[in-house]
């Protein structure tokens, strides 16, 4: 028996369902009574789901997994993982045994989009050219860790005095806070981009300083 899985990682959004595809080619006359199917975590060997002795043994992994029972006889051994969490990320191995056995691993990459950045300015009044200001760009509830870029109004990168911190919450999602310290010119636009490297999703925020008032 030969087991096939997708080579590319499966990308799943947090709180959505994901399908880890696995297939085999059944011989003519194959019956489910002959099939032993095991899904497990590749690294820890923890059992995730199994089908043995002709029946679905159910989920051994937080009751959020399911097979496609009607498709098993056609060689579809895919696993459905419901309500994906950050902690589900990793490699899963599909073992199929009929007379002989084979296995293959598939990677699950979890992702969550970042929110539109909010911009704050300190100080936020009585600003004059030559003042040092601190501009903070904050974006929330994303995964994995973001890439953060700052640009001026013409698109030139601002790489100087930037400090970026990323903190995971109890669900493993990141809140990102990036701080730019800059000396004000006569006027100027300061933009931050928060990029999710897995989703290739970009979230933009900007602040324009033209004396008063400020534009966010």
């Amino acid at each position: 028996v030969e087991v096939q899985v997708s080579e590319d990682p499966v990308v799943a959004l947090v709180d959505t369902d994901a399908t880890l595809r696995c297939s085999f080619s059944p011989e003519p006359g194959f019956s489910l009574a002959q099939l032993n199917l095991i899904w497990q975590l590749t690294d820890t060997k923890q059992l995730v789901h199994s089908f043995t002795e002709g029946r679905d043994q159910g989920s051994a992994y937080s009751n959020r997994t399911a097979l496609f029972p009607d498709l098993l006889v056609q060689g579809n051994a895919s696993l459905r993982l419901q309500r994906v969490r950050v902690t589900d990320e990793g490699s899963y191995t599909c073992f199929v045994s009929i007379q002989d056995f084979d296995s293959a691993a598939v990677s699950l990459q979890v992702a969550a989009p970042y929110s539109k950045p909010s911009m704050t300015l300190e100080p936020n009044k009585d600003l004059r050219p030559g003042n040092m200001v601190t501009i903070t760009c904050s974006s929330y509830q994303g995964y994995p860790e973001a890439e953060v870029f700052w640009k001026d109004g013409q698109g030139v990168p601002l790489t100087g005095n930037v400090t970026t911190s990323q903190m995971a919450n109890e669900r493993g999602l990141f809140d990102v806070h990036s701080v730019l310290r800059v000396v004000l010119g006569a006027n100027g636009t300061y933009s931050c981009l928060v990029r999710n490297p897995v989703l290739q999703q970009d979230a933009h925020g900007s602040v324009t300083i033209t004396g008063q008032p400020l534009t966010f």
Epitope: D152, G155, P157
Partner: antibody, heavy 121, light 108 residues
């Protein structure tokens, strides 16, 4: 019409410096950043850097740090790029181009005609 | 750096023929950040297509672009004599900005 006019061809000796100019016209020069790119003989394009034409803030490709210096003169709507310690490897056509994308998406809608630099002893 | 690999390196086409040039990125890029230029011998590059599929001002409708992820393409639906040129893809999804090595289109 919108255009970027570059200075003429340069033939220089190894070890010296050269300053290439790029004058914008037909638009508000200080509204758009200027990029510089290098095209070697029978070679592709290599991005050198970008300069803010309003305040002179600049950013360089790591490969050209210490080789290229970009400046701008707002009063004459001209961007400059100086290349130092020239070698035969620097012989190429150098282009300036106007940034037309958003802050985070760079592409070039107007290009100078190119300045041919030949470094030879 | 993100490397853009163009293929073919050179190609020849007859007037009226449909041709496709591909640009493969060494890592996934957002389609917003992939652009195409045309450069005729002795001239500066000219913006052809921006953000994968948007035609720049004045570019004939026979040019089109498509793609996502790591695979992008430029298509000329019916080649004309004036299309003989070198075509470059360019990305700014990853820093620094990079160009492909170019595809030279010759007319038969």
């Amino acid at each position: 019409q919108v255009q970027l006019q570059q200075s003429g061809p340069e033939l220089v000796r190894p070890g010296v410096s050269v300053k290439i100019s790029c004058k914008g016209s037909g638009y508000t020069f200080t509204d758009y950043a200027i990029h510089w790119a290098k095209q070697g003989h029978a070679k592709s394009l290599e991005w050198i850097g970008i300069i803010n034409t309003y305040n002179g803030n600049s950013n360089y490709n790591q490969n050209f740090k210490g080789k290229a210096t970009m400046t701008v003169d707002k009063s004459s709507s001209t961007a400059y790029m100086e290349l130092t310690r020239l070698t035969s490897e620097d012989s190429a056509i150098y282009y300036c181009a106007r940034n037309y994308g958003s802050s985070f998406n760079w592409y070039f809608d107007v290009w100078g005609q190119g300045t041919t630099l030949t470094v030879s002893s | 750096d993100i490397v853009l690999t163009q293929s073919p390196t050179t190609m020849a086409a007859s007037p009226g023929e449909k041709i496709t040039i591909t640009c493969s990125a060494s890592s996934s890029i957002s389609s917003n950040y992939l652009h195409w230029y045309q450069q005729k011998p002795g001239f500066s590059p000219k913006l052809l297509i921006y953000s994968t599929s948007n035609l720049a001002s004045g570019v004939p409708a026979r040019f089109s672009g498509s793609g996502s992820g790591t695979s992008y393409s430029l298509t000329i639906s019916s080649v004309e004599a004036e299309d003989a040129a070198t075509y470059y893809c360019q990305q700014y999804s990853g820093y620094p900005l990079t160009f492909g090595a170019g595809t030279k289109l010759e007319l038969k």
